[in-house]
């Protein structure tokens, strides 16, 4: 069944004498494998022999290949899928149909191609778009329908001639669809490509030329513009004459319309090549242009600077910056129209003319403050001299200047006193508008610049003010110099270091952290009564009976200080012990007998120990004995011993005496 | 060695006298250097101290004054040993009764005897 | 009569613990002032005497310190045999009295 049999190839293949031809090819035989192939060039069926006749290009059986024209022809295919066929070199006799006749077991097919082989290399077709601007990128496309892989070729672009320098990209097929060459090349072309060769060169692999194809580039674009102008400077004086004349060097397609512009902007009733101006002013001055339309869109001309020169006019002073700060730079310029631009200049402050000063720009890089004025120039050129304009006026601001504390009162201050004081200055820009004091205090500020303080503390040693307006200028501070009875009186124990025993060496000092004026009295007192006069008090060998409550006094011209009173505190070991006894040192036996250790000690006594008769020690360590129910073997003499960490003390000797009771003395 | 043997009755009724004995060996009743104590415990009391004995150039006692009234403490020189008597006993007397040295603390003491009052 | 209180009343540490008991005079009593420990069954032994001192034969690791009203007993690492309970005493003067106990337990 013939239907079985299906190819795909392209249909018609070109080449040239001596290259080469590749056939890309593909089938499919339903009923099972190719088992022969024949390649017939310009077949014709037999009906007689029922076979095809022709000349046999290629042979492929079960047998094996038949070599056939020296392997000029070669099947590149297989058994069941490709059918690929590759003829090189291609004779130009190869021309005209080639068959293909396929047998596998039980069917036979004839695919037929056509081959179409020229003497010379064919030329490649070069493609446009169909239209073309200037600056608007295209591609040009060359195509070849040929391509073959043992035969290699190049497509090269010229422009009159001449290679281009874009880089093009070639492509290849070698499909069973479609078989060519193809060279695009991505190009913006100018106005000045306009009717302009373009040639797509098809070359061997050596570069050597096979065939071209060629177009004229058609390049729409806006008209091309030369201006001219009398003068040729384009320089002239207010009431010349000048003529501007506009010509059209390219325009694709024709130009349809004529405009004049100046400094951007249209001039009316002016539409011809021509453009004539008389008795020119310097209003007139500017950039003038031609503006020529077509389809494409308006071209324009480059512009023309007319300079209408006259002399400098008024000029006005800018200053940069005003008002400006004591310390800070200035510029000053000067602004004047003219033309030419002015070559010298002379400035003025307040009405005076400024030395040397002939630059359009004045700079003052430290500014003071009699700089302060009026700035105005005058310009010249080689037209004439310019007017002095209104000038401009130039603030100075500093901070208030030579600022001052001035104490009003009458010296010496005494501590305690109301002191006023005032914040004086020399000048200012702009005016003071508040004062500052240092230190900061609960003072009150009757008026601007001046303070008052109450009760003027000893410690208030110097007070400063400033001035201020956008900035504070401090005075230096001034010395109140306050005079006041000492302070921090006090008594201070310098030797011993450690606690007073009774028999050390005492020296109290009388201190205090400061007086003013400096010369002082002292004043030691003991419970109303004065003891000395001197900075220290001293004790060669302190008694007990020194004990007490003491103060110093300091005093200067302007009053006196006490300290707080001290206590000197005398420790000793203890004194002065006895036993008493209670009820009385003649007890009844049976009854209670309670002996007690009198002592005077510093620090008090810890402990007391007991003694009898013999000296032998009793178990109790309190101030108190109590013999209870005491016996008549109690009776004898009984002493205590105090201990502080000082010391001991013993007492005397104290007899108890107990009698016998009325019992005993019945009994017996 | 100094130790303290106590001995008296476990068991006293009310209202009769408590009598305990407190012997001594390795140191002298007489010691004057020494007291002798009666000290008791009880749960609802803990410990406390009742009285002593000592000699010095003679005989001294102390008592606590909450048995004041009912106490005696004798010295024994001619067996080395001091007594302690309680008299007009309640249930509150039933304590531990301990004998014990005092020189500078209690340092030795006797085996402790509990004496119910019952 | 002076007053004895210890604190705390009663005590948990471990093994190791140093503990410290503390015990108040109602009055100053000088260094007059003695620790025991007891143990249940047995009779009061004396630790510390006159405050600080250590009583002959006991261990280095109980110590006392203080003199006037406040006293400190610090054993300095428990053993297993000091739990007990601990008295103060003081023999400043007549009557004698002694504090109501700390109860030192294993915690």
């Known amino acids: 069944d013939s239907s079985k049999w299906v190819f795909e190839h392209p249909e018609t293949l070109y080449a040239w004498e001596g290259a080469c031809v590749w056939i890309p090819c593909t089938y499919r035989a339903l009923d099972g494998d190719l088992e022969s192939f024949i390649l017939f060039h310009n077949p014709e069926y037999n009906k007689n022999t029922s076979k095809f006749d022709g000349t046999r290009l290629y042979e492929s059986t079960k047998d094996g290949k038949v070599p056939s024209e020296q392997k000029r022809v070669q099947f590149l295919g297989d058994k069941n899928k490709n059918c690929t066929l590759s003829i090189h070199p291609v004779h130009l006799n190869d021309s005209g149909q080639l068959g293909l006749r396929m047998e596998s077991k039980t069917e036979k097919w004839m695919e037929r191609i056509h081959l179409n082989v020229s003497e010379r290399p064919f030329p490649p077709h070069i493609q446009l778009p169909p239209e073309i601007q200037e600056s608007q990128e295209v591609t040009l496309t060359c195509l070849l329908n040929f391509s073959c892989y043992g035969y290699p070729i190049q497509l090269q672009w010229l422009l009159e001639g001449v290679p281009m320098r874009q880089a093009a990209v070639t492509s290849t097929s070698l499909t069973i669809k479609s078989v060519f060459t193809r060279s695009e090349l991505k190009f913006s072309p100018q106005w000045s490509h306009h009717g302009k060769i373009v040639t797509c060169q098809l070359q061997d692999a050596d570069g050597k030329f096979l065939s071209n194809d060629t177009v004229q580039l058609n390049v729409k674009h806006t008209p091309k513009l030369e201006i001219k102008v009398t003068p040729s400077d384009a320089i002239v004086r207010e009431g010349d004459s000048v003529t501007m004349t506009c010509e059209v060097s390219s325009s694709n397609p024709e130009y349809t319309t004529v405009s004049w512009l100046k400094d951007g902007t249209s001039l009316k009733k002016q539409n011809t090549f021509t453009l004539n101006l008389r008795e020119v002013t310097k209003d007139q001055s500017g950039k003038y242009c031609c503006q020529v339309s077509n389809d494409v869109g308006p071209g324009r001309s480059e512009e023309v600077f007319l300079q209408v020169q006259y002399a400098p006019e008024p000029s006005t002073v800018q200053i940069l910056h005003s008002p400006a700060v004591e310390g800070s730079q200035v510029e000053f310029l000067c602004m004047s129209l003219a033309n030419p631009l002015p070559t010298n200049y002379t400035w003025y402050h307040n009405g005076k003319e400024m030395q040397g000063r002939t630059e359009e720009k004045v700079h003052i890089p430290k500014i003071l403050p009699w700089h302060a004025g009026t700035y105005s120039c005058v310009a010249e050129n080689i037209l004439g001299t310019g007017q002095r304009g209104p000038g401009a006026e130039l603030d100075v601001q500093y901070p208030p200047k030579k600022v001052t504390t001035v104490i009003q009162n009458p010296m010496p201050i005494r501590e305690g006193d109301t002191v006023t004081l005032s914040c004086n200055y020399n000048s200012s820009n702009p005016s003071v508008t508040r004062y500052e004091w240092k230190p900061h205090g609960a003072w009150e500020e009757p008026s601007l610049g001046v303070l008052k303080i109450q009760n003027v503390g000893w410690d208030n040693t110097t007070i400063a003010c400033a001035a201020c307006n956008s900035w504070c200028s401090w005075a230096s501070p001034v010395a109140l110099n306050v005079q006041y009875a000492p302070r921090d009186v006090r008594v201070r124990k310098i030797k011993p270091l450690s606690e007073i025993h009774s028999g050390n060496s005492v020296s109290l000092q009388c201190d205090f952290s400061s007086s003013h004026p400096k010369e002082v009295q002292f004043f030691w007192e003991k419970n109303g009564r004065l003891l000395g006069k001197e900075s220290q008090l001293n004790f060669d060998s302190i008694s007990p009976e020194d004990a007490g409550s003491y103060s110093c006094w300091v005093n200067n011209s302007i009053g006196q200080t006490a300290s707080k009173a001290w206590t000197l505190e005398v420790l000793y070991a203890p004194r002065r012990l006895r036993v008493s006894m209670s009820p009385g040192d003649q007890v009844m036996e049976g009854k209670s007998a309670t002996l007690t250790c009198e002592s005077d000690a510093n620090p008090p006594v810890s402990h007391y120990t007991w003694f009898d008769w013999n000296n032998q020690s009793l178990p109790y360590h309190s101030q108190k004995l109590r013999l209870e129910p005491v016996k008549v073997q109690h009776s004898g003499a009984y002493w205590c011993q105090g201990t502080n960490s000082v010391g001991k003390g013993r007492s005397p000797l104290s007899t108890l005496t107990v009698y016998y009771s009325p019992e005993t003395i019945g009994r017996r | 060695q100094v130790q303290l043997q106590q001995s008296g009755p476990g068991l006293v009724k009310p209202s009769q006298t408590l009598s305990l004995t407190c012997a001594i060996s390795g140191d002298s009743v007489s010691s004057n250097s020494a007291a002798w104590n009666w000290i008791r415990q009880s749960p609802s009391r803990g410990l406390e101290w009742l009285g002593r004995?000592?000699?010095?150039?003679?005989?001294?006692?102390d008592y606590a004054v909450s048995v004041k009234s009912r106490i005696t403490i004798n010295p024994d020189t001619s067996k080395n040993q001091f007594s302690l008597q309680l008299s007009s006993v309640t249930p509150e007397d039933t304590a531990v009764y301990y004998c014990?040295?005092?020189?500078?603390?209690?340092?030795?003491w006797g085996q402790g005897t509990l004496v119910t009052v019952s | 009569d002076i007053v004895m209180t210890q604190t705390p009343s009663s005590l948990s540490a471990s093994v190791g613990d140093r503990v410290t008991i503390t015990c108040r005079a109602s009055q100053s009593i000088s260094s007059y002032l003695n620790w025991y420990q007891q143990k249940p069954g047995k009779a009061p032994k004396l630790l510390i005497y006159?405050?600080?001192s250590l009583q002959s034969g006991v261990p280095s690791r109980f110590s006392g310190s203080g003199s006037g009203t406040d006293f400190t007993l610090t054993i300095s690492s428990l053993q297993p045999e000091d739990f007990a309970t601990y008295y103060c005493?003081?023999?400043?003067?007549?009557?004698?009295?002694f504090g109501q106990g700390t109860r030192l337990e294993i915690k």
């Open positions: 005493q003081q023999s400043y003067s007549t009557p004698i009295t």
């Open positions: 004995t000592y000699y010095r150039s003679a005989w001294y006692n």
């Open positions: 014990a040295r005092d020189v500078e603390g209690f340092d030795y």
């Open positions: 006159a405050a600080s």
